[in-house]
């Protein structure tokens, strides 16, 4: 069978196999956030519910302030969507107004801290101008890629405007992770 | 080998390993809606296509009334894209009027129904406020994000509106699930 | 355990178990897009980065000449994120001068590539009318979904307009598949 | 099973106006945009508009802007077209229609004749 | 507004016949055309959705094709019941327009 070896005189080195079910998995869901300290010249990171309702960490994967925190080496599928809701951004007055404009946006990116470098490194960004003409607006931004990851590492969250994240459903606003 | 144990005189509890090519899965795509009755306060469940084209199950995920029927418990990825198309919403005109409004919204729902369970779940949620100004308008809506479920639990998509969805073609609007 | 079977009085055909870590994966993520021919009445393929940065492809995925090749028959899931980034559309002009408008739009296809099928196939596509009303606007397009795959199928993203792909971060555009 | 009933055949002079109703039975009334379409004897069909029942909202064809009016009435599933300052060149037979998508018709009414005349 | 065309306007035909009947749009409408049947004082049917999809509970005989502004419905094998006049509909932009139509009847 592919992947295993009984036979100790073949050489051949074979990776090895593991069960599905004990790979390091979790989804977390949107909590509201409490003003914080953020990071000068970078956009604050989320923090997120692990253990009610939909959301679980498993075999290992750990959440902790705001991180996720990667347990094992390998390549993981991480996603995010965040839902962004707001006025009606000074876009609008400033067009109407006749000049041009540089728009409003929002934007989430998921982003990798490792203790060994000095830099945290974006993996996945969405970024999109808002210049919304109804009184309200409400959006949301999807995330979702493949990386190879080390033990050790740490996964979080940034968005551009924290008070314009939805934190009113788990469903709207969630983040997670898992081992292929 | 991980995961594995030959040797009777362990007393450890492997996971048990299992050929990926057997997980449950399941692509569906879009077929055209005919008007129908929908349940009271509730948003409307598109039906699929299950086997023509790119749309298939497989491994006992079976597709049917509008239902993915999950056939083993574990952690499945959960994935689904609904392009909306309409014409010029009513937000333009009220806002020409100028008075502020509630703009129209466009909204996605992946539920999860557990016959044990009186209400349904809802896993994910996409929602957009519209306010185009366009005479003709179309966006997709994408949702994606790794589920614990158990067997027996049913998959569902709905809709805030099932006459804008787009249907003309089966990569613009779909719906699938994987065990991880 | 199953999936395995070392008793040979047994009959039964069990597909084979192989370790997830051999799997074929690819991410690619953007570079600056050179003018090239493009095929009459079908929208430019995107051309990628696929080792330096974030940008990986392993096991026999191998990229070449704007395709991800496929090594080996299988479920794979496939993703990409094009952010476009544009000048205001004509759109509001047209608007301002109170005429109904066809709007602009953007649009991103992942594409299948059979060498003994005549025609390429659509398997993914999202696409939106843009009619922005700010001088500059931006936006993210998402896809993912799983597909039953053969040996030797190709992939591709195209793009309907590709002066307007953001080509300036790794992580704002980018496209990916992994075997399940 | 899906079905439009109209009210019946009607007989106006010019200028006058008419109200044509759409009764809506088997499906949910407010889920599925209205349409109304036109044909003139021996002619083929004009999409004059549509109303959303749920919301209220409507998009009339630009010929008919300022003339037409779409309403509805949930409490009894029904949808009505009113079309004023009637001319001889309005007469037709005057369908409702339900599509699936707002962009197609996939139940018709059986028509309403409205004859123009003085 | 886009204009629909549809060629030839009438045609005579038997039973067992190959049907071609084409339409053409003033612009691209990308897939978003639909086909009617309509008989002599009735309401259209729906027969053909996003140009070649077959609405449920209508014969295989029947089959739309194209993309952008040509577009053709083809019966293949015409019956009885199939003598009536065609008509193509843009959904794609406001106002949606239907084609003049094509009488088919019996040579």
């Known amino acids: 069978l592919k992947g295993q070896e009984f036979a100790p005189s073949h050489q051949q080195v074979y990776a090895p196999l593991r069960a599905d079910g004990d790979k390091p998995r979790a989804h977390l869901t949107v909590v509201r956030q409490t003003p914080t300290q953020h990071f000068k010249n970078q956009f604050p990171a989320l923090h997120w519910e692990h253990e009610l309702g939909l959301a679980f960490t498993k075999n290992r994967m750990n959440y902790t302030n705001k991180f996720l925190l990667i347990p094992e080496s390998g390549d993981y599928f991480i996603y995010s969507q965040v839902t962004f809701r707001g006025m009606t951004s000074e876009c609008s007055e400033i067009r109407q107004a006749g000049r041009p404009n540089k728009p409003d946006s929002i934007t989430v990116v998921i982003t990798k801290v490792t203790d060994s470098y000095p830099e945290p490194t974006q993996l996945l960004m969405g970024t999109k101008s808002v210049c919304e003409v109804g009184s309200n607006w409400f959006q949301p931004i999807y995330l979702g890629a493949m990386f190879s990851l080390q033990e050790g590492d740490k996964l979080m969250v940034n968005v551009s405007d924290i008070s314009l994240v939805d934190y009113t459903k788990e469903d709207k606003t969630f983040f997670g992770a898992f081992l292929l | 080998l991980k995961g594995q144990e030959f040797a009777p005189s362990h007393q450890q509890v492997y996971a048990p390993l299992r050929a990926d090519g057997d997980k449950p899965r399941a692509h569906l795509t879009v077929v055209r809606q005919t008007p129908t009755q929908h349940f009271k306060n509730q948003f409307p469940a598109l039906h699929w296509e299950h086997e023509l084209g790119l749309a298939f199950t497989k491994n006992r995920m079976n597709y049917t009334n509008k239902f993915l029927l999950i056939p083993e418990s574990g952690d499945y990825f959960i994935y689904s894209q609904v392009t909306f198309r309409g014409m010029t919403s009513e937000c333009s005109e009220i806002r020409q009027a100028g008075r502020p409004n509630k703009p129209d919204s466009i909204t996605v729902v992946i539920t999860k129904v557990t016959d044990s369970y009186p209400e349904p779940t809802q896993l994910l949620m996409g929602t957009k406020s519209v306010c185009e100004v366009g005479s003709n308008w179309f966006q997709p809506i994408y949702l994606g994000a790794m589920f614990s479920l158990q067997e027996g639990d049913k998959l569902m998509v709905n809709v805030s509106d099932i006459s804008l969805v787009d249907y003309t073609k089966e990569d613009k609007t779909f719906f699938g699930a994987f065990l991880l | 355990l199953k999936g395995q079977e070392f008793a040979p009085s047994h009959q039964q055909v069990y597909a084979p178990l192989r370790a997830d870590g051999d799997k074929p994966r690819a991410h690619l993520t953007v570079v600056r897009q050179t003018p090239t021919q493009h095929f009459k009445n079908q929208f430019p393929a995107l051309h990628w980065e696929h080792e330096l940065g974030l940008a990986f492809t392993k096991n026999r995925m191998n990229y070449t000449n704007k395709f991800l090749l496929i090594p080996e028959s299988g479920d794979y899931f496939i993703y990409s994120q094009v952010t476009f980034r544009g000048m205001t559309s004509e759109c509001s002009e047209i608007r301002q001068a109170g005429r109904p408008n066809k709007p602009d739009s953007i649009t991103v296809v992942i594409t299948k590539v059979t060498d003994s099928y005549p025609e390429p196939t659509q398997l993914l596509m999202g696409t939106k009318s843009v009619c922005e009303v700010g001088s500059n606007w931006f936006q993210p397009i998402y896809l993912g979904a799983m597909f039953s795959l053969q040996e030797g199928d190709k992939l591709m993203v195209n793009v309907s307009d590709i002066s307007l792909v953001d080509y300036t971060k790794e992580d704002k555009t980018f496209f990916g598949a992994f075997l399940l | 099973e899906v079905q439009l009933v109209q009210s019946g055949a009607e007989v106006k002079k010019p200028g006058a106006s008419v109200k044509v109703s759409c009764k809506a039975s088997g499906y949910t009334f407010t889920g599925y945009y209205m349409h109304w379409v036109r044909q003139a004897p021996g002619q083929g069909l004009e999409w004059m508009g549509w109303?959303?029942?749920?919301?209220?909202?409507?998009n009339y064809a630009q010929k008919f802007q300022g003339r037409v009016t779409m309403t509805r009435d949930t409490s009894i599933s029904t949808a009505y077209m009113e079309l004023s300052r009637l001319r001889s060149d309005d007469t037709a037979v005057y369908y409702c229609a339900v599509g699936g998508s707002y962009d197609a018709f996939d139940i018709w009414g059986q028509g309403t004749m409205v004859t123009v005349s003085s | 507004d886009i204009q629909m065309t549809q060629s030839p306007s009438s045609l005579s035909a038997s039973v067992g016949d190959r049907v071609t009947i084409t339409c053409r749009a003033s612009q691209s409408i990308s897939s978003y055309l639909n086909w009617y049947q309509q008989k002599p004082g009735k309401a259209p049917k729906f027969l053909i959705y996003g140009a070649s999809r077959l609405q449920s509970g209508v014969p295989s005989r029947f089959s739309g094709s194209g993309s952008g502004t040509d577009f053709t419905l083809t019966i293949s094998s015409l019956q009885p019941e199939d003598f009536a006049t065609y008509y193509c509909q843009q959904g794609y932009s406001n106002p949606f327009t239907f084609g003049p139509g094509t009488k088919v009847d019996i040579k």
């Open positions: 109303i959303n029942p749920n919301s209220g909202g409507t």
